[in-house]
């Protein structure tokens, strides 16, 4: 029975040209995490395998950095990076857990303007 839950950073926004950390956390299960996949739409961005460590997609190796932890850092953001990102935890014996993050990449001035109205 799958008892675990995934907590994510939820909906986030970042500035064009900047960087952002995508984070997920699996809790409420004793299952062993064997691999974490980071995906955007149907594209595999990166893998963190328990035995083999991090592997980054050849298409994204200049803009994606592993970590911190099992998270993923996206760099040199463009408006095209806006969209859904998924962390997929492969575990034993539970199976697969999936978390969703929505990233909106904003033009610099919009991101700055929006920041003024954030509730502390």
């Amino acid at each position: 029975m799958m008892t675990g839950t995934i907590e994510t950073t939820g909906n986030i926004s970042a500035e064009k040209g900047g960087s952002i950390i995508l984070q997920c956390h699996l809790s409420s299960t004793t299952a062993q995490v064997t691999q974490v996949n980071w995906e955007q739409q149907d594209q595999l961005l990166a893998i963190c395998n328990a035995d083999l460590g991090w592997h980054i997609s050849p298409s994204f190796k200049d803009r994606v950095a592993p970590g911190p932890g099992l998270g993923l850092t996206l760099q040199s953001l463009t408006v095209n990076d806006t969209g859904e990102y998924f962390c997929i935890y492969h575990t034993y014996p539970d199976g697969t857990y999936t978390g969703r993050i929505f990233l909106e990449v904003l033009e610099s001035s919009v991101a700055e303007h929006g920041a003024r109205f954030q509730i502390p």
Partner: antibody, heavy 120, light 110 residues
Framework: EVQLLESGGDLVQSGGSLRLSCAAS????????MTWVRQAPGKGLEWVST???????YYADSVKGRFTISRDNSKNMVYLQMNGLRAEDTAVYYC??????????????WGQGTTVTVSS | QSVLTQPPSASGTPGQRVIISCSGT????????VNWYQQLPGTAPKLLIY???QRPSGVPDRFSGSASGTSASLAISGVQSEDEADYYC???????????FGGGTKLTVL
């Protein structure tokens, strides 16, 4: 849509060689282990070889030293070089995709197979 | 001889519940996920159950899987004539460093 298309099967003399190819499409090929499974006429499925995303290789004892699995991530191709073929290698050879970068997960997609016939 | 043990045949009448067993060892079923494949006559195998009990999209919910210890089973509740096929269990074997399959079970719908 994930697709695997095998080719290279043929009729060959005992002791001969063949190279099977598998063209993959519809997924981020670099991030998944690939496997060859065979099925002799009227028999069950038999694992032949697996290659992880980082090119770690695994072989069944029955083919070790005779068969070589390889992959070209830039071309989305996996190959099986078969040398020293024997009559008992006669089978339909299936190319299959794993759900993980490494191994021990689930073979989730199969090609339609290519037929190898070894005559003695 | 297959590493995983399955009955060679199983049968049922339409609407009946059919269970196919698969027995292994600690190094395969006991420590890794079990998969079930359906192979219709003249076609390639198709994933039916993965990670012991998960169904891929498109697989009818009459198919279910379970695993405990070193054994697994596939249940077909309300078997139908189109379910007539060969069924294989499989798991990664950590000692052999390879996939192991059951010998297959031929399901006949009477």
């Amino acid at each position: 849509e994930v697709q695997l298309l095998e080719s290279g099967g043929d009729l060959v003399q005992s002791g001969g060689s063949l190279r099977l190819s598998c063209a993959a499409s519809g997924f981020s090929f670099w991030g998944y282990a690939m496997t060859w499974v065979r099925q002799a006429p009227g028999k069950g499925l038999e694992w032949v070889s697996t290659i992880a995303g980082n090119s770690y290789t695994y072989y069944a004892d029955s083919v070790k030293g005779r068969f070589t699995i390889s992959r070209d991530n830039s071309k989305n191709m996996v190959y099986l070089q078969m040398n020293g073929l024997r009559a008992e290698d006669t089978a339909v050879y299936y190319c299959a995709k794993d759900r993980s970068f490494y191994n021990y997960y689930d073979i989730d997609v199969w090609g339609q197979g290519t037929t190898v016939t070894v005559s003695s | 001889q297959s590493v995983l043990t399955q009955p060679p045949s199983a049968s049922g009448t339409p609407g009946q519940r059919v269970i196919i067993s698969c027995s292994g060892t600690n190094s395969n079923i006991g420590s890794n996920h079990v998969n079930w494949y359906q192979q219709l006559p003249g076609t390639a195998p198709k994933l039916l159950i993965y990670t012991n009990n998960q169904r891929p999209s498109g697989v009818p919910d009459r198919f279910s899987g379970s695993a405990s210890g070193t054994s697994a089973s596939l249940a077909i509740s309300g078997v139908q004539s189109e379910d007539e096929a060969d069924y294989y269990c499989a798991a990664w074997d950590g000692s052999l460093n390879g996939w192991v399959f059951g010998g297959g079970t031929k399901l006949t719908v009477l």
